[in-house]
């Protein structure tokens, strides 16, 4: 029950996280004009990964897409790539995890296969979350660097007679959405991995009981059955069963030998 809850919760958290990553990637407010300690302009500038926008006091907003690839800063391209990779991995992870959910029965899919898929989706969610966090952090670092550079220009570039409004940019809402979403996806991924650890032993214990019922001589120690619901001693349980460290793939091949006599 706890495994199902952990897996389900991990899925929901990751789903929210990936939706957040998609939202952050599409948002226009990655960087917004810094209004602090600045002559108040009647125009508010903000920028996203795909376009920059200007909102006037009149209420009119005009957005222009970055219609060039080659002319864009390498860092911006890198952030775009990280966010897209995060979305793609997250989407695949969601697809895999739907089939891996313990509460969903698909044909005669074994729990060991579900454990595999849960682990795979968990890893995908973790990488997806890390990609999003990395992307947002790279952009934030770029903003901080530019902010201090333009601040320096504000105080050193006053030599000319004509003053210019130095437009400085600060963190936009999308950065916070991205950080939170990346964190949620990461947490969801970790939960899926934890759920996978709980799924695998239950799977093996089930086989041990079924072997006994079918009259086969079983080399497994029945004592391992008692610990089947616990999360903490899963690796010990595996060793109790037959002294060797088996991969998930090896465990998966057993049913074909014994279960269907």
């Amino acid at each position: 029950m706890a495994v199902t809850a952990c897996q389900g919760l991990g899925f929901v958290v990751s789903l929210i996280g990936i939706a957040g990553i998609i939202a952050a990637t599409c948002m226009d407010q990655w960087s917004t004009q810094d209004l602090y300690n600045n002559p108040v302009t009647a125009v508010f500038n903000y920028q996203g990964l795909w376009r920059s926008c200007v909102r006037e006091s009149s209420g009119f907003t005009e957005c222009r897409g970055y219609f060039t690839l080659l002319g864009l800063p390498a860092m911006l391209q890198a952030v775009r790539a990280l966010m897209i990779v995060g979305i793609v991995l997250g989407a695949i992870g969601l697809l895999v995890s739907i089939f891996a959910l313990k509460c969903i029965r698909i044909g005669s899919m074994e729990d060991s296969a579900k454990a595999n898929m849960t682990l795979t989706s968990g890893i995908m969610f973790i990488v997806s979350g890390l990609c999003a966090i990395a992307g947002v952090s790279v952009f934030a670092n770029m903003l901080v660097t530019n902010f201090w550079m333009s601040t320096a220009n504000m105080y050193t570039g006053m030599g000319g007679m004509v003053q210019t409004v130095q437009t400085r940019y600060t963190f936009g809402a999308a950065l916070f959405v991205g950080w939170v979403a990346g964190g949620l996806t990461l947490i969801g991924g970790v939960m899926m991995c934890i759920a996978c650890r709980g799924l695998a032993p239950e799977e093996t214990n089930y086989k041990a009981v079924s072997y006994h019922a079918s009259g086969h001589s079983v080399a497994y120690k029945p004592g391992g059955f008692k610990a089947s619901t616990g999360f903490g001693s899963n690796t010990k349980n595996k060793k109790t069963y037959d002294g060797g460290a088996h991969t998930e793939d090896e465990l998966q091949s057993y049913p074909s030998k014994h279960d269907y006599v």
Epitope: P39, V43, N45, S57, S58, E62, Q163, T164, T167
Partner: antibody
Framework: EVQLQQSGPELVKPGASVKMSCKAS????????MNWVKQKPGQGLEWIGY????????KYNERFKGKATLTSDKSSSTAFMEVSSLTSEDSAVYYC???????????WGQGTSVTVSS | DIVMTQSPSSLTVTVREKVTLSCKSS????????????LTWYQQKPGQPPKLLIY???TRESGVPDRFTGSGSGTDFTLTISSVQAEDLAVYYC?????????FGAGTKLELK
């Protein structure tokens, strides 16, 4: 057709207050910011401030803070400006004007003439 | 506050003459976000409210004759009337609509010779 109809001329005593109106028609009132501009006889234009009828947000020229108060009434699509503690310096024509793309004022009222005299 | 300086203060012209009005701002009106200059030109005839001619320094308002052309960037702007007509005799104001408070120039009065 967009129209901004302003209230009639006012003759007021020094120290008094005057409240003028600007009734908008021909467009959705809450979609556009309304500006107020002062013009003394034979002189140039001076921006007083604006009100956003959508949320009643205002922006004032520091010179007119405490002197002018901008309000609006969505139900009647009317913007108001109250000028208080009137002196001869406040004798002028006051215009309301709609703020448009590029922060330009595209439609103007015909103006309300205020004369401060004892 | 941004100071808008218009020159000349008055100009005597003949019909069909080409006229150039100047407007200088004490601070740049160029917005880096969209590379647009937030300067507006108005025409005011006696006893009438001002009329919008040009916004974004060079964009002609609909219905304004194409003999009116706005140009310039940053701090220096010009309004050109390619062939002055009798109905163009008025006062022309430039306005900063970039930094609060919005400020107007003192105006250039166009008079007939």
């Amino acid at each position: 057709e967009v129209q901004l109809q302003q209230s009639g001329p006012e003759l007021v005593k020094p120290g008094a207050s005057v409240k003028m109106s600007c009734k908008a028609s021909g467009y959705t009132f809450t979609n556009y910011v309304m500006n107020w501009v002062k013009q003394k006889p034979g002189q140039g234009l001076e921006w007083i401030g604006y009100i956003n009828p959508y949320n009643d947000g205002t922006k004032y020229n520091e010179r007119f803070k405490g002197k002018a108060t901008l309000t609006s009434d969505k139900s009647s699509s009317t913007a108001f400006m109250e000028v208080s503690s009137l002196t001869s310096e406040d004798s002028a024509v006051y215009y309301c004007a709609r703020l448009y793309r590029g922060n330009a004022m595209d439609y103007w009222g015909q103006g309300t003439s205020v004369t401060v005299s004892s | 506050d941004i100071v808008m300086t218009q020159s000349p203060s008055s100009l005597t012209v003949t019909v069909r003459e080409k006229v150039t009005l100047s407007c200088k701002s004490s601070q740049s009106l160029l917005n880096s976000g969209n590379q647009k200059n937030y300067l507006t030109w108005y025409q005011q005839k006696p006893g009438q409210p001002p009329k919008l001619l040009i916004y974004w320094a060079s964009t002609r308002e609909s219905g304004v004759p194409d003999r009116f052309t706005g140009s310039g960037s940053g701090t220096d702007f010009t309004l050109t009337i390619s062939s002055v007509q009798a109905e163009d005799l008025a006062v022309y104001y430039c306005q900063n609509v970039y930094i609060y408070p919005f400020t107007f120039g003192a105006g250039t009065k166009l008079e007939l010779k």
